[in-house]
């Protein structure tokens, strides 16, 4: 018959991260005589978690809360719990003697970390894609227990299925962390568009933690260009305009060329923005053709966000205008916008 | 009800030896730690000995160890105490006590007086 | 050894009022938070009864006038009201495992 018996009744306990986890253990008998100690794990390499008698436990406090006849509380808390407090704690009743020998354990409590994940990071690519391009996101989260989680991407409030999603590691393990990787088609209208990764998991209680990026660090809308003829304004000038619409980032240069050569280079200022996010900006060349015997050919050359140049050419007939020598081939223009100028 | 019954209390020389019984009865015997303590108008109450239930643990004080001997008898319900070389000191009244715990002494027999005198 | 000195040794109360008396430790009795202290009824030709284990629990079929508190060191077993029947010598007892398990000299409560 069992002499004495060491009760630990929860086989399993859950604590979120930060809070005490009580352990609790009951002992029908002091005999024989001798110390009950605390373990976490089993086997030679078993952690003293507590100890009455000697040692200095700062997190653990006894927690005496039975009044029955029939057994003595043994139970401990746990303060400040990490995840690296998890794993299985034993109550063990020893033998009082030199040494002290074991001489009997609880069946073993089984403590679980409850830990939040981190705010997930989403990432996108390290250099701008153009529309109909795929580009990929990664999302991180690191440090959540367990290890049950649920990640799920969205484009606009739109869910994504295209993603691939690991949680590391595979084993037991304190904590974990998860890795995603999503693949989205840009379109034209994504400057305003976000990427948004959703985790789930059972510490936040149904409130999920959401990390974005905006597409717009990440796409590049080039610009399409037209260059356009005005009425001529003055007797011997001609306005050509270069409207360069939906280009997404700002950062632009144009630089006009007569027959080939450089007449004026200047940097988008004053742009307007489209209700999608993209730019239209618009620069005009005043060209006095009595300085040309012969048909000009007037280039708008664009270079956007550091791509190769894009240019749009137009040739201006001079045939039907009387020439006049020694005028300069370009006018000085006086502004760079989107007025017509008649 | 619980009933614990000490005999073989009596009169003995200094040196000489005694066998103290408890017959138990009212509870199940075989689950409880059973002690004797003794008293004395001179010292009070003083533990003297301790059995654990199944009886393969028994301590004592040190004013009793090597000259004690404690045992039981589960399936007679009985507890012995085995005095050798006793001492004008022990004379006392010798109470049987059960205890659930091993913890506190939850009943005590009414007590046989052993008198050590020459 | 443990040594428990109990206070007063004898102690006189009127019927009706309180009766409080002391046990103290030489050293600490406590286990995981329970204190290994318990109190003993021994009324003239009787064997003494449990009235009190683990410093604060009450033994079946004691009348609730009787009460104990304490930790550590400090103990008090406290009477109240004080009734006829209870005229008696009252002790302490601490059974933590550090052996020998001693018992304090005892109260006598009279009635004043």
């Known amino acids: 018959e069992e002499e004495l018996q060491v009760i630990q009744p929860d086989k399993s306990v859950s604590v979120a991260a930060g809070e005490s986890a009580i352990l609790h253990c009951t002992v029908t008998s002091l005999i024989p005589v001798g110390p009950i100690q605390w373990f976490r794990g089993a086997g030679p390499a078993r952690e003293l978690i507590y100890n009455q008698k000697e040692g200095h436990f700062p997190r653990v406090t006894t927690v005496s809360e039975s009044t029955k006849r029939e057994n003595m509380d043994f139970s401990i808390s746990i303060s400040n719990i990490t995840p690296a407090d998890a794993g299985t704690y034993y109550c063990v009743k020893f033998r009082k003697g030199s040494p002290d020998t074991e001489f009997k354990s609880g069946a073993g409590t089984e403590l679980s970390v409850r830990a939040k994940p981190s705010a997930p990071v989403v990432s996108g690519p390290a250099a701008r894609a153009t529309p109909q391009h795929t580009v990929s996101f990664t999302c991180e989260s690191h440090g959540f227990s367990p290890r049950d989680i649920t990640l799920k991407w969205f484009k606009n409030g739109n869910e994504l299925s295209d993603f691939q999603t690991n949680v590391d590691p595979v084993g037991e393990s304190v904590s974990y962390s998860i890795h995603s990787t999503a693949k989205v088609v840009l379109t034209r209208e994504d400057v305003h568009s976000q990427v948004i990764c959703e985790v789930a998991h059972v510490t936040l209680q149904g409130d999920p933690l959401r990390g974005t990026a905006n597409l717009s660090e990440t796409i590049r809308v080039p610009p399409t260009l037209e260059v356009t003829q005005q009425p001529v304004r003055a007797e011997n000038q001609v306005n050509v305009t270069c409207q360069v619409r939906k280009f997404y980032p700002q950062r632009l240069q144009l630089t006009w060329l007569e027959n080939g050569n450089v007449s004026r280079t200047e940097t988008a200022s004053t742009v307007t923005e489209n209700k999608d996010g993209t730019y239209n900006w618009m620069s005009w060349l005043l060209v006095n053709v009595s300085a040309h015997r012969d048909d000009v050919k007037l280039t708008c050359q664009v270079e956007h966000d550091g791509q190769p140049a894009v240019s749009k050419s137009h040739d201006l007939k001079v045939s039907a205008h009387p020439k006049e020598q020694g005028s300069n081939t370009a006018a000085e223009n006086t502004g760079s916008n989107e007025r017509n100028i008649y | 009800e619980v009933q614990l019954v000490e005999s073989g209390g009596g009169l003995v020389k200094p040196g000489g030896s005694l066998r103290l019984s408890c017959a138990a009865s009212?509870?199940?015997?075989?689950?409880?730690?059973m002690s004797w303590v003794r008293q004395t108008p001179g010292k009070g109450l003083e533990w003297v000995a301790t059995?654990?239930?199944?009886?393969?643990?028994?301590y004592y004080p040190s004013s009793v160890k090597g000259r004690f001997t404690l045992s039981r008898d589960n399936a007679k319900n009985s507890l012995y105490l085995q005095m050798n070389s006793l001492r004008a000191e022990d004379t006392a009244v010798y109470y049987c006590?059960?205890?659930?715990?091993?913890?506190?002494?939850?009943?005590w027999g009414q007590g046989t007086t052993v008198t050590v005198s020459s | 050894d443990i040594v428990l000195t109990q206070s007063p040794a004898s102690l006189a109360v009127s019927l009706g009022e309180r009766a409080t008396i002391s046990c103290r430790a030489s050293?600490?009795?406590?286990?995981?938070?329970?204190?290994?202290m318990h109190w003993y009824q021994q009324k003239p030709g009787q064997p003494p009864k449990l009235l009190i284990y683990?410093?604060?629990n009450l033994e079946s079929g004691v009348p609730d006038r009787f009460s104990g508190s304490g930790s550590r060191t400090d103990f008090t077993l406290t009477i109240n009201p004080l009734q006829a029947e209870d005229v008696a010598t009252y002790y302490c007892?601490?059974?933590?495992?550090?052996?020998?398990?001693?018992f304090g000299g005892g109260t006598k409560v009279e009635i004043k």
């Open positions: 006590a059960s205890s659930l715990t091993g913890s506190s002494f939850d009943y």
């Open positions: 009212g509870f199940t015997f075989s689950s409880y730690v």
């Open positions: 059995i654990s239930s199944g009886g393969t643990y028994t």
């Open positions: 007892h601490q059974s933590s495992d550090e052996l020998p398990w001693t």
């Open positions: 050293e600490s009795v406590d286990l995981y938070g329970t204190s290994f």
């Open positions: 683990r410093a604060s």
